[in-house]
Amino acid sequence: KGMHVAQPAVVLASSRGVASFVCEYGSSGNAAEVRVTVLRQAGSQMTEVCAATYTVEDELAFLDDSTCTGTSSGNKVNLTIQGLRAMDTGLYICKVELMYPPPYYVGMGNGTQIYVIDPEPCPDSD
Amino acid sequence: KGMHVAQPAVVLASSRGVASFVCEYGSSGNAAEVRVTVLRQAGSQMTEVCAATYTVEDELAFLDDSTCTGTSSGNKVNLTIQGLRAMDTGLYICKVELMYPPPYYVGMGNGTQIYVIDPEPCPDSD
């Protein structure tokens, strides 16, 4: 079995389409370099939402065009997914890889069900 | 064991604070008068949200000041709860009682987790 990864079962996106959750991994060693990937599961299909490698010293850095941002503290990663719409409601799985130094470990959480509700449009001002 | 009552596990309230779900009960007989109660569970506490008695011929009627409305068809009740705010997020249990004719039956569903997100206020029009 892989490394244990914990994440909340359910999260509600804000009315602005932003959802945040903590992904925590259990590691016996001291990883200097960790890769975090957020996957969306639809049926048996998994699609990558975003990914980032961070070092324990540095801030978590996602790609500039990413829908995700994050911060890390020890073995906890605070993940924020932006730009969510109602059609993005689904199960979001946190995958953690301890990349360096060896040994390499990998673990996946059970997934966070993110619920997204599209806001009502504001009335036009006359 | 009580009468079987089925309801969905999860429902999202709309951005207007309206949540709808179906409560279905399994009855061997043909009840003429049925009472439906919606309860909100918080910890070990249960509070009544709304209740209505209906006859198979008539429409489901909640009190005028109720936060609930509903329609019935056979052994299915379509419940709608209005005016929900984020603080109302919680487990809503459907309780069904077959009041008349005897024998009296009662059953409770496992609850529907209703998630409510408060909308962002619309910008003031200048």
Epitope: G2, A32, E33, R35, T53, L63, M99, P101, G107 | -
Partner: antibody
Framework: EVQLVETGGDLVKPGGSLRLSCVAS????????MNWVRQAPEKGLQLVGG????????YYTDAVKGRFTISRDNAKNTVYLQMNSLRAEDTAVYYC???????WGQGTLVTVSS | QAVLNQPASVSGSLGQRVTISCTGS????????VAWYQQLPGTGPRTLIN???NRASGVPDRFSVSRSGNTATLTISGLQAEDEADYHC???????????FGSGTQLTILG
């Protein structure tokens, strides 16, 4: 498509030097630590060493410590293995691999012989 | 050089099932994961089974693994011609503080 292509393998005399390159494509190279692994003729695989994603930290197996140096140039998507004081027992096919072992290159042959 | 012990060769007929063992010690397989790699002639290794025991992307479910004590086993069921290759196991050795590999097993598909 992820690709790792090793080059630089050659025939070299004992005590000589050689630099191997591994060019990566198809993935975010700068986000991944990389490993070098070798396979001597008719032998199993052996870890040579590795380097972290930024290139600031390396590790080596005891057999090559002090003789081999791993470096990387993220702008060129390339990881290097500088081999000095080569010995006959360094003869092998050398592979680069992502540190999660998801992808390996096709290898480059280094022969150390007089 | 190889710390993990594998049989030099195994063989099986098309459609059959074969097993490849990988035996180590209490400092590697006994307390760490085991990964498996397939190596076709003239190519680099390809990961079959990741360190979490799951099949790598695109690997059919004919490949499965088990572990008992200090021995890991790769099982290939429903043998196909394209399975003819070398198979390597690896683990992390907590005493040597390095990855250790098996000597490799050559799988031959019979007529």
């Amino acid at each position: 498509e992820v690709q790792l292509v090793e080059t630089g393998g050659d025939l070299v005399k004992p005590g000589g030097s050689l630099r191997l390159s591994c060019v990566a494509s198809g993935f975010s190279f700068s986000s991944y630590a990389m490993n070098w692994v070798r396979q001597a003729p008719e032998k199993g695989l052996q870890l040579v060493g590795g380097i972290n994603s930024g290139g600031s930290s390396t590790y080596y197996t005891d057999a090559v410590k002090g003789r081999f140096t791993i470096s990387r140039d993220n702008a060129k998507n390339t990881v290097y293995l500088q081999m000095n004081s080569l010995r006959a027992e360094d003869t092998a096919v050398y592979y680069c691999a992502i540190s999660n072992w998801a992808y390996w290159g096709q290898g480059t042959l280094v022969t150390v012989s007089s | 050089q190889a710390v993990l012990n594998q049989p030099a060769s195994v063989s099986g007929s098309l459609g059959q099932r074969v097993t490849i063992s990988c035996t180590g010690s209490s400092s590697d397989i006994g307390k760490s994961y085991v990964a498996w790699y397939q190596q076709l002639p003239g190519t680099g290794p390809r990961t079959l089974i990741n360190v979490d025991g799951n099949r790598a992307s695109g690997v059919p479910d004919r490949f499965s693994v088990s572990r008992s004590g200090n021995t890991a086993t790769l099982t290939i069921s429903g043998l196909q011609a394209e399975d003819e290759a070398d198979y390597h196991c690896s683990s992390w050795d907590w005493s040597l503080h390095t990855y250790v590999f098996g000597s490799g097993t050559q799988l031959t598909i019979l007529g």
